[in-house]
């Protein structure tokens, strides 16, 4: 016996109470695929969430976060508080980045300043809580006798060896 439910399109469900007739999803529910035996409950976007896309009979609602919060998790399942640049979110709230670290976004954690000396370079612009350091030429390049008029060597294209 062929399963009549497989004929039910998205936006409907196969109603076993009515001899497997395809019934439309009731209000506040949806089915995004055909052949469903029930419709799923629509997500609500309330409180700290706001509606980005309304629920329809064939697709769930999509939520965003209100101003001052940003989405986390799959399909914006959570809203996390924004912090200011130069801060990170801890269990106790937004805290300034420790010395030697920075965060240039409203989310995420404070990251250590780049260590210019690891690349044989010097610090051109000091780091702040909001900005990473800017590395400049190596100290040797800046020593007396080194010509500042020499144009920099052209950057190599990745994967190409020098001619």
């Amino acid at each position: 016996l062929q399963d009549l439910c497989s004929n039910c399109p998205a936006g409907t469900f196969c109603d076993n109470n009515r001899s497997q007739i395809c019934s439309p999803c009731p209000p506040n529910s949806f089915s995004s695929a055909g052949g469903q035996r029930t419709c799923d409950i629509c997500r609500q976007c309330k409180g700290v969430f706001k509606t980005r896309k309304e629920c329809s009979s064939t697709s769930n609602a999509e939520c965003d976060c209100i101003s001052g919060y940003h989405c986390l998790g799959a399909e914006c399942s959570m809203c996390e508080q924004d912090c200011k640049q130069g801060q990170e979110l801890t269990k106790k709230g937004c805290k300034d980045c420790c010395f030697g670290t920075f965060n240039d976004q409203k989310r995420g954690i404070c990251r250590p300043w780049t260590n210019c000396s690891l690349d044989g370079k010097s610090v051109l612009v000091n780091g702040t809580k909001e900005r990473d350091v800017v590395c400049g030429p190596s100290p040797a390049d800046l020593s007396p006798g080194a010509s500042s008029a020499t144009p920099p060597a052209p950057a190599r294209e990745p994967g190409h060896s020098p001619q």
Partner: antibody, heavy 118, light 111 residues
Framework: QVQLQESGPGLVKPSETLSLTCTVS????????WSWIRQPPGKGLEWIGY???????NYNPSLKSRVNISVDTSQNQFSLKLNSLTAADTAVYYC????????????WGQGTTVTVSS | QSVLTQPPSASGTPGQRVTISCSGS????????VNWYQQFPGTAPKLLIY???QRPSGVPDRFSGSKSGTSASLAISGLQSEDEADYYC???????????FGGGTKLTVLG
């Protein structure tokens, strides 16, 4: 499964501040709303306010000037402070978890009776 | 004065079907799903129906919910003596950005 337990004083004097704490056990405080609801003797349920785990709050306008709700995710607790108490604040106070998908209050504490009297 | 309006009392005999109504406005029931709670004396409310007509696990299928426009109703079929309790409707209110409750209905099972 998730359980909620209210704690705080049972008797408070008029004009003082009520402080209640709700401890969440058996689950995480993250990704839910946490509400306070009260029920005066012989009356219905009144929503006081909620806090989302990341700190967003909203309060019943009739109580907004007197209420503060805070959350401590490290302790898995959230708290209610209600100031300038009068006898009309005498009630059973419940904490509850509000689901952040369909917004039903699916887990409740057993409630704590607060009497405002001198 | 509750935002949602329920009859203060309802009654029925064992085996009967009873319905409890809940009336609101466009900012709450008209635009949002309705939840129902059952409360026995001296205990905390329990979620009975969510999203208009969904039953949490463990709730008997004798309990059903429906919504039309700015009103909702809870139906209890095959009424039993243990159904005697207070019933509250609740919905999110967009103007408050929070939930609102009905005043509650005391259900009495006669006989």
């Amino acid at each position: 499964q998730v359980q909620l337990q209210e704690s705080g004083p049972g008797l408070v004097k008029p004009s003082e501040t009520l402080s209640l704490t709700c401890t969440v056990s058996g689950g995480s405080i993250s990704s839910y709303y946490w509400s306070w609801i009260r029920q005066p003797p012989g009356k219905g349920l009144e929503w006081i306010g909620y806090i989302y785990y990341s700190g967003y709050t909203n309060y019943n306008p009739s109580l907004k000037s007197r209420v503060n709700i805070s959350v401590d995710t490290s302790q898995n607790q959230f708290s209610l402070k209600l100031n300038s108490l009068t006898a009309a604040d005498t009630a059973v106070y419940y904490c509850a978890r509000t689901h952040s998908y369909y917004y039903g209050m699916d887990v409740w504490g057993q409630g704590t009776t607060v009497t405002v009297s001198s | 004065q509750s935002v949602l309006t329920q009859p203060p009392s309802a009654s029925g005999t064992p085996g009967q079907r009873v319905t409890i109504s809940c009336s609101g406005s466009s900012s709450n029931i008209g635009n949002n799903p309705v939840n129902w709670y059952q409360q026995f004396p001296g205990t905390a409310p329990k979620l009975l129906i969510y999203s208009n007509n969904q039953r949490p696990s463990g709730v008997p299928d004798r309990f059903s919910g429906s919504k039309s426009g700015t009103s909702a109703s809870l139906a209890i079929s095959g009424l039993q003596s243990e159904d005697e309790a207070d019933y509250y409707c609740e919905a999110w209110d967009d103007s408050l950005n929070g939930p609102v409750f009905g005043g509650g209905t005391k259900l009495t099972v006669l006989g």
